[in-house]
């Protein structure tokens, strides 16, 4: 009976240093197999003693055509089990197998970590035929190895729908430590502890970490990767980096700046964009944020007037946009305006103060003692009033606006007249007879039109009626006077 010899496949431990059945090389490793005697390669790296049972999948060949003798089971010959080399070196390794000539169309494929290697790989298969068997040597070469070439490589051969698999060849590419996590720049609160993390990998392992703060080593002894540095607090900006060491050498991380959060710098360039009688639109350029986002800003407004009590009005606003409309101001007044902004640490100093003025306002009171009477001979209405007691902020009086509304039998018509500031009387032509005329007067400044006086009504009779009694607004009452004829 034919028995199948098998052995437990044990994974090779991945640690630096030569292993039984391993090749450590820092030069080009060319496991070349010249054709010397028949198909037997001359140079083989064998981790096993002679006569060691073969491993991997074995194909049990069928009986020969004559039916007289059995062929030995097919298996790949043992080769080097573990190749250790430095990054950027070249490596070549191979599988070999002797296949009886009765088998046709034998192909060998290379696999890495369970995936077939296809395409642009340097795989060469050479055949060395003999009388009864053909030696097949499949070579795989990698130029300038990288870490990504690390892994377990095997050969597979299909024969009669059977698959023969070689022992794995472990390729371990060693190099300088490679950072998988580096410290990050941060903005921190003064005298408050924070953490930085550094992680680097080989192979070779172990990777040891040294922390550097402002060019001074923080830890005198190496710490295993990954390492978390608890910085006990800073009073000023500092630069941190970490050094990763392994047997191949040293890699230094990027240096990161740790900033200390502070109050913001004051805003600059406070500008006036628009002024009205009661509002001023300002903008500003934010100062440096102190390594902490702005939360809000405060607009401070002081009236520049020797008679004012010097109190400051404060208007809070969001930090963005850098613009604010100050409202509820007095007309024709001078103000000093400053801006301050805050972050989580506190308020900035106030910006340089700027002067701004509101424009003239409209009058706030109506003309007084409005009287209206009919001058029938001239067919007009005489209107008289007293100049209102306007505040300085309303600006200079430029005139008056007279509104007269004529109402009769379902018809209503409003007319407006403008008169100069020196006048305190006006005459308007009668528009309609047998009608009511309602008169209101407002003072006008550059700032606008003030409130209209209370309406004064006068009845305009049909032709032939004579009455010179005036209608008037009492001063200062708010009755609705009507001339009763």
């Amino acid at each position: 009976a034919i028995t199948e010899a098998r052995e437990e496949a044990k994974p090779y431990p991945l640690f630096p240093g030569p292993l039984p059945g391993s090749l450590q090389t820092d030069h080009t490793s060319l496991l070349s197999l010249p054709h010397t005697s028949g198909y037997q390669p001359a140079l083989m790296f064998s981790p096993t003693q002679p006569g060691r049972p073969y491993t991997g999948n074995v194909a049990i060949p069928r009986v020969t055509s004559a039916g007289s003798k059995l062929l030995p089971p097919l298996a790949f010959k043992h080769t080097v089990g573990h190749i250790i080399l430095s990054e950027h070196k070249d490596v070549k390794f191979n599988c070999s197998i002797s296949v009886p000539n009765i088998y046709q169309d034998t192909t060998i494929s290379w696999w890495k970590d369970g995936k077939e290697l296809l395409g642009a790989h340097h795989a060469i298969t050479q055949f060395y035929p003999d009388d009864e068997v053909t030696a097949i040597i499949a070579s795989f070469s990698i130029t300038s190895v990288q870490r990504s070439d690390n892994g377990s490589y095997i050969c597979k051969m299909k024969i009669n729908n059977e698959e023969i698999v070689s022992d794995p060849i472990y390729i371990e590419v060693q190099g300088l430590p490679h950072f998988t996590k580096q410290p990050e720049s941060m903005n921190v609160t003064r005298n408050t502890a924070f953490n930085l993390t550094c992680q680097a990998v080989g192979p070779p392992e172990p990777v040891n970490i040294f922390w550097v703060q402002n060019s001074s080593r923080v830890n005198e002894q190496p710490e295993k990767s990954p390492s978390v540095l608890t910085v006990p607090g800073l009073t000023e900006m500092a630069v941190f980096s970490c050094e990763a060491h392994n047997d191949k050498g040293l890699t230094v991380s990027k240096g990161v700046q740790i900033n200390i959060k502070a109050i913001p710098s004051p805003p600059t360039e406070v500008s006036i964009h628009n002024s009205t009688a009661h509002s001023i639109l300002i903008s500003w350029v934010p100062g440096f944020d102190g390594y902490s986002p702005f939360r809000n800003c405060s607009v401070q407004v002081k009236e520049v007037d020797p008679l004012s009590n010097g109190s400051v009005m404060i208007f809070n606003t969001s930090a963005s946009p850098h613009m604010y409309q100050i409202k509820q101001l007095q007309a024709l007044a001078n103000y000093s305006i400053g801006v301050s902004c805050m972050n989580e640490i506190g308020w900035s100093a106030v910006s340089p103060w700027i002067l701004a003025s509101t424009t003239e306002g409209a009058p706030s009171v109506a003309p007084l003692n409005v009287t209206v009477f009919l001058n029938e001979s001239r067919d007009n209405v005489d209107i008289r009033w007293m100049k209102p007691l306007t505040k300085r902020q309303a600006g200079e009086l430029v005139g008056y606006r007279i509104s007269h509304v004529w109402q009769s039998a379902g018809i209503s018509k409003e007319l407006l007249e403008e008169v100069g500031q020196n006048n305190s009387r006006a005459q308007i032509s009668v528009q309609v007879h047998n009608a009511t005329c309602t008169v209101r007067i407002a003072a006008v400044t550059k700032g606008g039109v003030g409130p209209f006086s209370d309406p004064v009504k006068i009845f305009i009779p049909a032709h032939g009626w004579v009455d010179h009694a005036p209608s008037s607004t009492p001063a200062p009452g708010n009755a609705d006077p009507v001339l009763i004829i």
């Epitope: 005298n191 402002n214 001074s216 923080v218 830890n219 005198e220 710490e223 540095l229 006990p232 607090g233």
Partner: antibody, heavy 118, light 106 residues
Amino acid sequence: QVQLVQSGSELKKPGASVKVSCKASGYTFTNYGVHWVRQAPGQGLEWMGWINTYTGEPTYAQGFTGRFVFSLDTSVSTAYLQISSLKAEDTAVYYCTRGTRYAYMDYWGQGTLVTVSS
Amino acid sequence: EIVLTQSPATLSLSPGERATLSCRASSSVGYMHWYQQKPGQAPRPLIYATSNLASGIPARFSGSGSGTSYTLTISSLEPEDFAVYYCQQWSSNPRTFGGGTKVEIK
């Protein structure tokens, strides 16, 4: 708990040698350096240097080179300070300390008094 | 070598009083550690990295400072606080100690 236990007091003649031991317990010995600090009678603390317990490499402060040797036996978590050709001015209490990040000495031995007198 | 100068050399105070100890460095240092030593005893860690209390140290002790100027403050002296206090710098080798400040009972 972390402990550093030093060997007992020594009385030596000038020209002799002395070896002070410092046995560490309660932590992984090779993770922290061992520093040595001298305190002469009535004087302040003077840093002598330290030994890297991971590599065995010693670092000596100025004035402590030549006659002073730091060594280790990691198998028994012990650091040693050896002083040769002793002089009267070597009379002092010698402390071993555990060094951590930022050169902070967080644990101290109880001190070993070395008296050099003829 | 960074030289650390502690002042005053001696501070005479009564229990309950506030003690302010100064340590000046000849050039800027990253952190300052403080140790307390009583007669016949080994030094004991007090303040780590300028302002962090070592384990078991009461809150009446505090540390502050930056650059070349560092301070240890004891807000209200207790009888057990009368001792010698040393500062020690971290920045560059060698690791130097200050000359010490003795806090004695007035």
